[in-house]
């Protein structure tokens, strides 16, 4: 049985040309997690594997760096950036977990951090 | 260099037993998942088994549940295929492929030819 | 189960030629779409990883494109050595699937 929940960074924004971390937070559960993809919509960006490190989808090297932990660090933010992200966290024995964060880069520099909040 | 050699193959009557081999050299073989994908003669790729990495966690192709089981020796740098009441449709060159991230198949085995017939 | 859809299943074409193949998922897959090569008595040999990126040592006329359910693998100019089978894979989620292939022959 599923019992972890994911809390992510939630509904955020930055200013274009700037960056921003994604993060999410398994909690609850006790499952050994083996891996975390990031996905941008139909994207892969990155991988973390418990074995074999990060792997950075080579069309995004430039512009994403492993971590902080498990996260993701978005850089030099366009406004294309704009969009859902997931964070898919594989484990063991429980499954899948599947965090979403909506980003939207703004053209201002007025760009505020949404709340935290879970999902179950 | 990586490497991939299976072994084991041959000529087995319906109903009877086989273990594929696959030794891998080159990397380390513990970190990453591993597959097995068949061939029959003249038609396309089919996946059989896959094993991860950490949790040795296996999954398989519903033709072959139930009587395949896939595992794996991080010590001996093997792989494995335990065949049983294999059927003539399972006649087949049959590969082992390394899988990191359990995404892509990046190296693969020469392959080792079953032939189950009476 | 997830079905890949490729086609065409054979072309025939020319030294030089722009090359496409596609191939459909069932369902959506995001990126989880990969593409070998395999020539006769050979083992598959891994072209694109996760829709669009080269795998290394892969020529860089290979290219990949797609996301969801519909992805394409160009030659942009075929060489003599591409004459193959090529097949797409996904691995979304188990039972891992490949499509049917497309074999480009010699026009």
């Known amino acids: 049985m599923m019992t972890g929940t994911i809390e992510t960074t939630g509904n955020i924004s930055a200013e274009k040309g700037g960056s921003i971390i994604l993060q999410c937070h398994l909690s609850s559960t006790t499952a050994q997690v083996t891996q975390v993809n990031w996905e941008q919509q139909d994207q892969l960006l990155a991988i973390c594997n418990a074995d074999l490190g990060w792997h950075i989808s080579p069309s995004f090297k430039d512009r994403v760096a492993p971590g902080p932990g498990l996260g993701l660090t978005l850089q030099s933010l366009t406004v294309n950036d704009t969009g859902e992200y997931f964070c898919i966290y594989h484990t063991y024995p429980d499954g899948t977990y599947t965090g979403r964060i909506f980003l939207e880069v703004l053209e201002s520099s007025v760009a505020e951090h949404g709340a935290r909040f879970q999902i179950p | 260099e990586v490497q991939l050699l299976e072994s084991g193959g041959g000529l087995v009557q319906p109903g009877g037993s086989l273990r594929l081999s696959c030794a891998a050299s080159?990397?380390?073989?513990?970190?990453?998942?591993m597959s097995w994908v068949r061939q029959a003669p003249g038609k396309g790729l089919e996946w059989v088994a896959s094993i991860k990495s950490s949790t040795s966690s296996t999954y398989y192709a519903d033709s072959v549940k139930g009587r395949f089981t896939i595992s794996r020796d991080n010590s001996k740098n093997t792989l494995y295929l335990q065949m049983n009441s294999l059927r003539a449709e399972d006649t087949a060159v049959y590969y082992c492929a390394r899988e990191p991230y359990s995404v892509w198949m990046d190296y693969w085995g020469q392959g080792t030819l079953v032939t189950v017939s009476s | 189960d997830i079905q890949m859809t490729q086609s065409p299943s054979s072309l025939s074409a020319s030294v030089g030629d722009r090359v496409t193949i596609t191939c459909r998922a069932s369902q959506s897959i995001s990126s989880y779409l990969n593409w070998y090569q395999q020539k006769p008595g050979k083992a598959p040999k891994l072209l694109i990883y996760?829709?669009?990126s080269l795998q290394s040592g892969v020529p860089s006329r290979f290219s990949g494109s797609g996301s969801g359910t519909d992805f394409t693998l160009t030659i942009s100019s075929l060489q003599p050595e591409d004459f193959a089978t090529y097949y797409c894979?996904?691995?979304?989620?188990?039972?891992?699937?490949f499509g049917g292939g497309t074999k480009v022959e010699i026009k």
């Open positions: 080159g990397f380390t073989f513990s970190s990453y998942a």
């Open positions: 894979q996904q691995s979304y989620s188990t039972p891992l699937t």
């Open positions: 996760a829709a669009s």
